[in-house]
């Protein structure tokens, strides 16, 4: 049956036993500066292209043992759930992976800005359709990163992020705290924003929208055919990273402010449980929660 | 995220450190009154100094971002600093990132060009 | 353009080994592993399992798994499919074919097991 | 004995439309998107007609169309040519494998 979070992002009219768009997504790439990740898991085999592109800091400790599946954790699940054949939202996208994040989830903002840069070099030799730019990673607000996020998306690319597991105001963390991007806060289930150990999602006014991001079934790289289950503001954001790649496919002349104000329209609104957030965030923090078009919308997003 | 929102640095540290001399013989000193402003990471385990990006003004022409990396090495140099360019930027932002001593800062940010310097630090999976 | 090309036919007896080759090209190797499919005579197709491109990783089919070892060397893009203990039932045209979409198929490798 | 059901056979005239099922179970073609069908002339590889269960390769002839429903997917075939004359295998993924049908033969008449 249909993963909770498929059926929730999914306009009433297509649940059925099972969710499946066709072709969702097919003339947008979906860029994703993450770890490295197994590009022919047979969730995702033939829908990334991984770009030579490598920019991450050694891991940490003397005695980490680098072992395959673990560095590839984190990119191909999100991978998988961005473009995955049977448990992703945007079946029809095509990716394309950057790995800024080490074997232990841990990058530099220099080296996520010059991965951004390789994008924006990528656009000008060789322009495509609609680019969608997953940045499922948080570090401390930085003026340069949400700087080169800021052009990136004045040149007209559409930049996703997750909000942080932090537990705390959005503002204090880039990229989420860049106004240009698309920045995703995690609710579960329940509609309740997710609580992850002692922290949880982010919230506060640089928060966009939340989507599903608690128990997502995914791309495992412990083998080829595995599935697993994670949680994050990550897994959050690129269900939105999905669901902009389907808009952008069946509306490609859409700009960010467009596509902000159909993402926010097209929310399931006001379902999140508000006492979560602290008394004094509550007002600031957007309640909604991401969903596609509904079926008025078929012949463009189910053809 | 959230567009219509002011600028806001949060607990962001922001140092300014003010354009003294014009030391060096700079062949194009900054403009009277300017000031870059070197930043740097409020969460201090995240830090990672000895990497700084520093950006240049927008305008600033690959070429320019080149020659001034170039003359931060050769004053670096002078004062028995060894410095590392590690990558140039263009196509984003002007600027280029340099692996160098915090010493050199206040002398970085006196180069021509120089808008503000950020130093390095850590982002992470979510 | 995208091309599996297979070694030749083999004539092997009751007990011995195969090791069939196919070698890859026309695309990005690592974005797909390689499935070998095997169909014996007047029958139908049955998939024999996979290997990775990018880490070496496999997946047998249960029915052949103990006597089935498949290999890469990324530096000629060939895979190896080796068949051990042969039996006469193993006898078979052989395909390797891209991924587990299958895709693109070789040319596809007789082999014969006869006393 | 094969994972997946098909008919033998099949058969059909110029122009008509056929359909060929393949029944499986909520552990493959029922629990999974990825249905796949191939087309199989005799001494020659087979060759791939609809991938997840209804989209065409490049190069497929729309008269080629697949889909699923339950435990069950369809390929049909429309306005059938002579050339249309072979073996079709459909296939789906498993928790940990592949599965192949075992086969329908179609005749051209």
């Known amino acids: 049956s249909i993963p909770w979070n498929l059926e929730r992002i999914t306009p009433p009219r297509y649940r059925a036993d099972e969710y499946q768009p066709p072709d969702g997504g097919s003339l947008v790439e979906v860029y994703l500066l993450d770890t490295s990740i197994q590009s022919d898991h047979r969730e995702i085999e033939g829908r990334v292209m991984v770009t030579d592109f490598e920019n991450v800091p050694e891991e940490d400790g003397t005695r980490f043992h680098r072992q395959a599946s673990k560095c590839d954790s984190h990119g191909t699940h999100l991978a998988g759930v961005v473009s995955g054949r049977d448990a992703g939202v945007a079946k029809g996208a095509s990716m394309r992976s950057l790995r800024v994040l080490n074997c232990q989830g841990k990058g530099t903002v220099s080296g996520t800005l010059i991965g951004l840069e390789f994008i924006r070099k990528s656009q000008l030799v060789q322009p495509v359709g609609p680019l969608v730019v997953l940045l499922p990673l948080a570090g401390g607000y930085s003026r340069v990163l949400n700087a080169a996020c800021q052009r990136l998306a004045r040149a007209g690319v559409v930049l996703v992020t997750a909000a942080g597991n932090f537990r705390d105001d959005a503002c204090l963390y880039s990229p989420a705290s860049a106004p240009e991007v698309i920045t995703v806060g995690a609710t579960n289930a329940q509609d309740q924003p997710v609580t992850l150990g002692t922290l949880g999602t982010n919230f506060g006014r640089c928060v966009d929208l939340f989507a599903p991001g608690e128990d997502i079934i995914g791309a495992s790289s412990d083998c080829s055919t595995c599935f697993v289950s994670q949680s994050g503001t990550s897994q959050a954001a690129a269900h939105v990273a999905g669901i902009a790649a389907m808009m952008l496919s069946a509306e490609p002349e859409l700009t960010l402010a467009e596509l902000r104000q159909r993402l926010i329209h097209f929310s399931a609104k006001d379902v999140i449980n508000e006492a979560w957030f602290p008394e004094d965030q509550r007002v600031l923090t957007p309640n909604l929660v991401a969903a596609l078009p509904p079926s008025t919308h078929e012949n463009l997003y189910f053809q | 995220g959230a567009m219509g929102q002011e600028d806001e640095d949060g607990d962001y540290e922001e140092l300014v450190l003010a354009l003294r001399s014009e030391e060096d013989g700079l062949a194009e000193a900054p403009e009277h009154g300017t000031t870059a402003t070197f930043h740097r990471c409020a969460k201090d385990p995240w830090r990672l100094p000895g990497t700084y990006v520093v950006v240049l003004k927008e305008e600033t022409h690959l070429s320019q971002s080149e020659r001034t990396a170039r003359r931060l090495q050769a004053q670096a140099a002078r004062r028995g600093y060894l410095t590392k360019i590690l990558h140039v930027f263009h196509g984003l932002l002007p600027g280029f990132l340099v692996k160098m001593s915090g010493d050199l800062l206040e002398l970085a940010l006196k180069l021509p060009h120089v808008d503000y310097i950020e130093e390095d630090s850590s982002v992470f999976a979510q | 353009q995208i091309q599996l090309v297979q070694s030749g036919a083999e004539v092997k007896k009751p007990g011995a080994s195969v090791k069939v080759s196919c070698k890859a090209s026309g695309y990005t190797l690592t974005s797909y592993g390689i499935s070998w499919v095997r169909q014996a005579p007047g029958q139908g197709l049955e998939w024999m399992g996979w290997?990775?491109?990018?880490?070496?990783?496999?997946n047998y089919a249960q029915k052949v798994q103990g006597r089935v070892t498949m290999t890469t060397d990324t530096s000629t893009s060939t895979v190896y499919m080796e068949l051990r203990s042969l039996r006469s039932d193993d006898t078979a045209v052989y395909f390797c074919?891209?991924?587990?979409?299958?895709?693109?198929w070789g040319q596809g490798t007789t082999v014969t097991v006869s006393s | 004995q094969s994972a997946l059901t098909q008919p033998a056979s099949v058969s059909g005239s110029p122009g008509q439309s056929i359909t060929i099922s393949c029944t499986g179970t909520s552990s493959d073609v029922g629990g999974y998107n990825s249905v796949s069908w191939y087309q199989q002339h005799p001494g020659k590889p087979p060759k791939l007609m609809i991938y997840e269960v209804s989209n065409r390769p490049s190069g497929v002839s729309n008269r080629f169309s697949g889909s699923k429903s339950g435990n069950t997917a369809s390929l049909t075939i429309s306005g059938l040519q002579a050339e249309d004359e072979a073996d079709y295998f459909c296939s789906s993924y498993t928790s940990t494998s592949m599965v192949f049908g075992g086969g329908t033969k179609l005749a051209v008449l």
């Open positions: 290997i990775s491109f990018y880490n070496g990783n496999t």
């Open positions: 074919a891209r991924g587990y979409g299958m895709d693109v």
